[in-house]
């Protein structure tokens, strides 16, 4: 009975999410493998988040709006491990917007989800950020490594969206 009611609950939750995400990819996790964590297909998952690489070239504002429509934000990178996971799926000759900007040009960088900007956990390329005119951050491959660079916000780039996993 317990298992049956849990399955019914899951199915109704799945139906609820299906109006937003036509397809979900779920894996069993948790202590007793009783919890399912899901990401929209074809998003990838890492720890408690889902990631989507958008190859549509758009300005930073339009990229953020695009993520928002999907229930996500431009990516907020919190650890080196997270960045390493993300960059496995990026093309080395492309640049991708992050959810990091400095809208007033005061070098007060802020993440879209209001996560505090921690200077000790940043991965700027050497010499970056280098211009208060360039108020949005990208991740790109330079000098044999992935890192961040400040760029003009209105210049179209690819982007990375991030959302919390859906638990059912």
């Amino acid at each position: 009975n317990f298992m049956y009611s849990k399955t019914v609950k899951r199915l109704s939750k799945l139906q609820e999410y299906q109006q937003y995400y036509p397809s979900l990819t779920c894996v069993m996790e948790g202590k007793d493998m009783e919890d399912w964590s899901c990401c929209p297909t074809p998003w990838t998952s890492f720890q408690s988040s889902c990631y989507f690489i958008s190859t549509v070239m758009q300005s930073w504002t339009k990229s953020q709006n695009n993520c928002s429509v999907m229930g996500a934000d431009l990516v907020v990178i919190n650890t080196k491990e997270e960045q390493d996971f993300i960059t496995q799926n990026l093309k080395i000759n492309s640049a991708y917007f992050l959810g990091l900007s400095d809208p007033k040009g005061w070098r007060h960088w802020q993440w879209v989800d209001q996560t505090p900007y921690n200077k000790n956990v940043t991965f700027w390329h050497s010499g970056e950020p280098n211009s208060p005119d360039e108020r949005c951050a990208i991740i790109n491959f330079r000098s044999e490594e992935w890192g961040w660079n400040d760029v003009h916000c209105h210049v179209p780039q690819k982007s990375i969206c991030k959302m919390k996993k859906i638990y059912i």
Epitope: D133, E134, H154
Partner: antibody, heavy 121, light 111 residues
């Protein structure tokens, strides 16, 4: 007082090349992003190129990409536009302008008087 | 590309009367409470001059008879009391996304 003085325009044959210059004074040129905008005779305005303050990022519309190159020499307070493979439709007055950011967008706040480029055989 | 459509193409207004110019973007140029539309004035034989930025902010040194309004896709430049020196072509421009694009211009004349 901000001053921008364009030079280098003239008559050139289709397929030819020309280099425009913009001499800047009255502001700290090396800290400003700069742009070129053009205006065909009797027509509207068209953005042509932008370069960031350090000269390491350049941007172009598809209409000139691969043919035009924007560059700058901060030691000489000068902006350049190298125009290759010129076409009749590139005939226009070319203006250089200073770029001022506004949150996630920008404005072109100071403009030079322009230099005329005519592409004709 | 974002297309900026201005109307009317030309406008004849009596001195001291109000002039209104419209600009429509093919998609929204707003984000987080700001609109990325600028207005420029170009007098014959002169370069463009910035009047309004961010849809409604008056550039320093511009007379306050000029004002801008609008959001999303629809924007307006208003000259509250037309003066002889306002005879010019007026352009809207979006800076939300490259390529920056301008409207086709509106010529303002004295009736």
């Amino acid at each position: 007082e901000v001053q921008l003085l364009e030079s280098g325009g003239g008559l050139v044959q289709p397929g030819g090349s020309l280099r425009l210059s913009c001499a800047a004074s009255g502001f700290t040129f090396s800290t400003y992003t700069m742009s070129w905008v053009r205006q065909a005779p009797g027509k509207g305005l068209e953005w042509v190129a932008t370069i960031n303050s350090g000269g390491d990022n350049t941007y172009y519309p598809d209409s000139v990409k691969g043919r035009f190159t924007i560059s700058r020499d901060n030691s000489k307070n000068t902006l350049y536009l190298q125009m290759n493979s010129l076409r009749a439709e590139d005939t226009a007055v070319y203006y250089c302008a200073t770029y001022r950011p506004y949150y996630y967008g920008s404005v072109l706040d100071y403009w030079g008087q322009g230099t005329t480029v005519t592409v004709s055989s | 590309d974002i297309v900026m459509t201005q109307s009317p193409d030309s406008l004849a207004v009596s001195l001291g009367e109000r002039a209104t110019i419209n600009c429509k973007a093919s998609q929204s140029v707003d984000y987080d409470g700001n609109s990325y539309v600028n207005w420029y004035q170009q007098k014959p034989g002169q370069p463009p001059k910035l009047l309004i930025y961010g849809a409604s902010n008056l550039e320093s040194g511009i007379p306050d008879r000029f004002s801008g309004s609008g959001s999303g896709t629809d924007f307006t430049l208003t000259i509250s009391s037309l003066q002889a020196e306002d005879v010019a072509v007026y352009y809207c421009q979006q800076s939300d996304e490259d390529p920056w694009t301008f409207g086709g211009g509106t010529k303002v004349e004295i009736k």
